[in-house]
Interface confidence: low
């Protein structure tokens, strides 16, 4: 606000006042009179730029008169008091109330003094974010959606991600006249590495004290990615039994594990136990390639591992496996 004047009366008011759609708002307006200055206020007047006539008048002897009595009210002005406070309350803010207003004091002997106030009509948006569940498309697709509904002015949406990708943002009229719904999609090429990771939608709006952060956990459906572990190339005869593990990553979870060899079914010394294959001790060298086939709702994938059980006992009889 401008500082009080030192030699003249000054009308004090903020240059801009925000108000929310449907709510009430006060347009503050005060007459600053220096200590020694004598002045007499005969009338307070509010008008809107571009419109003829006054929307609110408070006359020193006749009191208030409003263009819309149910929507306007002088906050502090009263008959029989010094008219120093012209603050006006507006009820049920509408989009069309946004604009420039003039607050005017008619004083004697100084004449008229006025100030302009810009009323901004805001609407606080509601924000939501949701995952867009996808499969491995091989091309960029939306994986997350962030919607800011019913903002005025439109909310600003940005994304924060360590996964790469790019936003696609659009606007549409909000349900209430003058409001805007902003929809932003986060688009990337889905991969198994993306599944379970998160991106954050940041919504900024001048009605918010601080930006709203909405985190979305991504979902990418993909067939199993399979590997076999548990063999260290140092398996020997006469050792304890060992275990191979079929390691599978997939979404949705694997529904089945099937062990076999390149020659067909499992040999007698190999026993399948779900994701694990138990290798019992053998009495002669073997060279076998094991296959683990993993199935989920999107398909089946397999991994192969060649196991050699060699002659020559290890230094410690601790088992064929280093596990």
């Amino acid at each position: 606000w401008p500082p009080p004047g030192t030699g003249d009366i000054i009308v004090q008011a903020p240059t801009q006042v925000p108000g929310f759609l449907g709510d009430s708002v006060t347009l503050p307006c005060y007459l600053q009179v220096p200590g020694m200055e004598e002045t007499h206020v005969s009338q307070l007047t509010w008008s809107r730029h571009g419109e003829s006539g006054s929307m609110a008048v408070f006359h020193q002897t006749q009191g208030p008169n409003y263009s819309e009595p149910k929507r306007l009210e002088f906050v502090a002005a009263r008959l029989g008091t010094e008219l120093r406070d012209a603050s006006l309350r507006m009820f049920g803010l509408r989009v069309e109330d946004e604009g420039n207003y003039t607050c005017l004091f008619v004083t004697f002997p100084q004449g008229s003094r006025s100030v302009d106030i810009w009323l901004r009509v805001l609407a606080k948006p509601q924000n939501t974010a949701e995952v867009q569940k996808v499969q491995l498309t091989g091309k960029p697709v939306p994986v997350a959606r962030c919607v800011s509904t019913g903002g005025r002015p439109p909310a600003h949406i940005t994304w924060h991600s360590d996964l790469g990708g790019m936003p696609n943002t659009s606007q549409a009229p909000g349900f209430l006249s003058g409001t805007v719904t902003v929809t932003s999609l986060w688009i990337l090429v889905p991969s198994s590495q993306v599944d379970g990771k998160s991106v954050t939608c940041k919504v900024e709006h001048e009605s918010f004290e601080k930006p709203q952060l909405l985190t979305v956990n991504l979902t990418v459906y993909y067939p199993p990615e399979v590997s076999i572990s548990g063999y260290d190339n140092n398996w020997y005869l006469s050792q304890n039994e060992a275990t191979l593990t079929c390691d599978a990553r997939s979404n949705p979870e694997p529904t089945g594990y099937n062990w076999s060899t390149t020659m067909g079914p499992l040999p007698p010394f190999a026993v399948a136990q779900g994701a694990q294959l138990l290798i019992r001790p053998v009495d002669k060298p073997i060279n076998t390639t094991f296959i683990c086939n993993v199935t989920n709702a999107l398909g089946a994938r397999q991994a192969e591992l060649t196991v050699q059980v060699k002659e020559g006992p290890p230094s410690e009889p601790s088992g064929m496996s280093s596990n």
């Epitope: 759609l21 449907g22 009820f91 049920g92 509408r94 069309e96 919607v147 509904t149 659009s170 549409a172 009229p173 349900f175 209430l176 006249s177 719904t181 929809t183």
Partner: antibody
Framework: QVQLVQSGAEVKKPGASVKVSCKAS????????ISWVRQAPGQGLEWIAW????????NYNQKFTGRVTMTTDTSTSTAYMELRSLRSDDTAVYYC??????????????WGQGTTVTVSS | QAVVTQEPSLTVSPGGTVTLTCRSS?????????ANWVQQKPGQAFRGLIG???NRAPGVPARFSGSLLGDKAALTLSGAQPEDEAEYYC?????????FGGGTKLTVL
Amino acid sequence: QVQLVQSGAEVKKPGASVKVSCKASGYTFTSSYISWVRQAPGQGLEWIAWIYAGTGDTNYNQKFTGRVTMTTDTSTSTAYMELRSLRSDDTAVYYCARHGYTGRGWYFAVWGQGTTVTVSS
Amino acid sequence: QAVVTQEPSLTVSPGGTVTLTCRSSTGAVTTSNLANWVQQKPGQAFRGLIGHTNNRAPGVPARFSGSLLGDKAALTLSGAQPEDEAEYYCALWYSNKFVFGGGTKLTVL
């Protein structure tokens, strides 16, 4: 002239689902809001939800959340309302209504002819 | 849960004036409630008359007007015609949903 033509009457068993269609013509479908409203026998109107055809953005009456899904097919200018887990008290005439714009706000402008859904075992 | 109440029935003479009202159980109706008025004639489709409290839909005769009357929304019919005999529903918006009133059966006789 603006028209909304709805699909024909349906008879369903409790627990089933129903999908009602509403084909629009005579205006730009993607720049419109469509509400779904129902009227049970001898009762007043009950608002179910609205959808913005351009983006598919929806707003559901909480009473129906989880049971109703609204969609649009912009290629055919058709709106759909699917209601699941039907109960006998879902028996009603279901209407789609396009909202018009007056410059100040929206109003229920043009209505479909209604689709009677009967839920009975 | 908001409840919207209308007069169950009203009668008006041809050429007369009648006001239908719409009350909210949550308090005074304001412009934020976006009061809508819808007409249903027997055997015909619904027709939107008024939106946003007082905005007449295109093609609606000027004898229909919407307003706020005290703490209620109102639909005033000035110079009633026989063809205005119908059921009239109001709908109010409560932040995230519309709630319809039970309807007023208007008889012109």
